[in-house]
């Protein structure tokens, strides 16, 4: 840590990695709950066009993937994996690519990802192939 | 040595607008990625843009966006962050910081300049 730069009071955001060196943030799609027209594809691009530095440095990117009667939706966020999201906990945070998992919700098809590389929740994984045969 | 000095700081009232300029030397200045952040009184960093080299892309954290905008002048060796519309919580010393990867996949070397303070007050 810079030796000028104080420790914050609530320590909240001033993460360091082993080093003790300041860990950044790192930059995911975030365009919350949008309509989308991905389905039946082993992958889709998010078509969402902004992207933004995470709020807090141990935040990681999640996307998640609703289909009901009605629509479709495709959400992107950063969240922290210590905390749940949507009720579920982020296993694959560490991941840096976001292959969806389903999660059993009533009345909708719920998928879920979380990765931790740039943009990552940029390209949503659905492939059950990917997620056996590829070791990334 | 690597040096970072930013400039551009002071009192703003509410609504106002200020730019910010960092000046750096002993690195090659064009190739490194660089971000401005902030750290308000009693709180933590907050990471307010970066841009990349080469390219020049840019991102904001959302409580800047459409606020802010970085910028550099490679000719110059000096990143720019232009603030509009300042608020009472934009109050902060803002530092300029350079990273660059070490070579082992996920690490990095960072440098910070001493920072220059904002106070938005009416």
């Known amino acids: 840590i810079p030796p000028h730069v104080q420790k914050s009071v609530n320590n909240d955001m001033m993460v360091t990695d082993n080093n003790g060196a300041v860990k950044f943030p790192q930059l995911c799609k975030f365009c919350d709950v949008r309509f989308s027209t991905c389905d039946n594809q082993k992958s889709c691009l998010s078509n969402c066009s902004i992207t933004s530095i995470c709020e807090k440095p141990q935040e990681v990117c999640v996307a998640v993937w609703r289909k009901n009667d009605e629509n479709i939706t495709l959400e992107t966020v950063c969240h922290d994996p210590k905390l749940p999201y949507h009720d579920f906990i982020l296993e694959d945070a560490a991941s840096p690519k976001c292959i969806m998992k389903e999660k059993k919700k009533p009345g909708e098809t719920f998928f879920m990802c979380s990765c931790s590389s740039d943009e990552c929740n940029d390209n949503i994984i659905f492939s059950e192939e990917y997620n056996t045969s590829n070791p990334d | 040595e690597v040096q970072l000095l930013e400039s551009g700081g002071g009192l703003v009232q509410p609504g106002g607008s200020l730019r910010l300029s960092c000046a750096a030397s002993?690195?090659?200045?064009?190739?490194?990625q660089m971000w401005w952040v902030r750290q308000a009184p009693g709180k933590g960093l907050e990471f307010v843009s970066r841009i990349d080299s080469p390219g020049g892309r840019t991102y904001y954290a959302n409580s800047v966006k459409g606020r802010f905008t970085i910028s550099r002048d490679n000719s110059k060796n000096t990143l720019y962050l232009q603030m509009n519309s300042l608020r009472a919580e934009d109050t902060a010393v803002y530092y300029c910081a350079k990273r660059r990867p070490t070579g082992v996949s996920g690490t990095f070397y960072d440098y910070w300049g001493q920072g220059t303070l904002v106070t938005v007050s009416s």
């Open positions: 002993g690195f090659t200045f064009g190739t490194e």
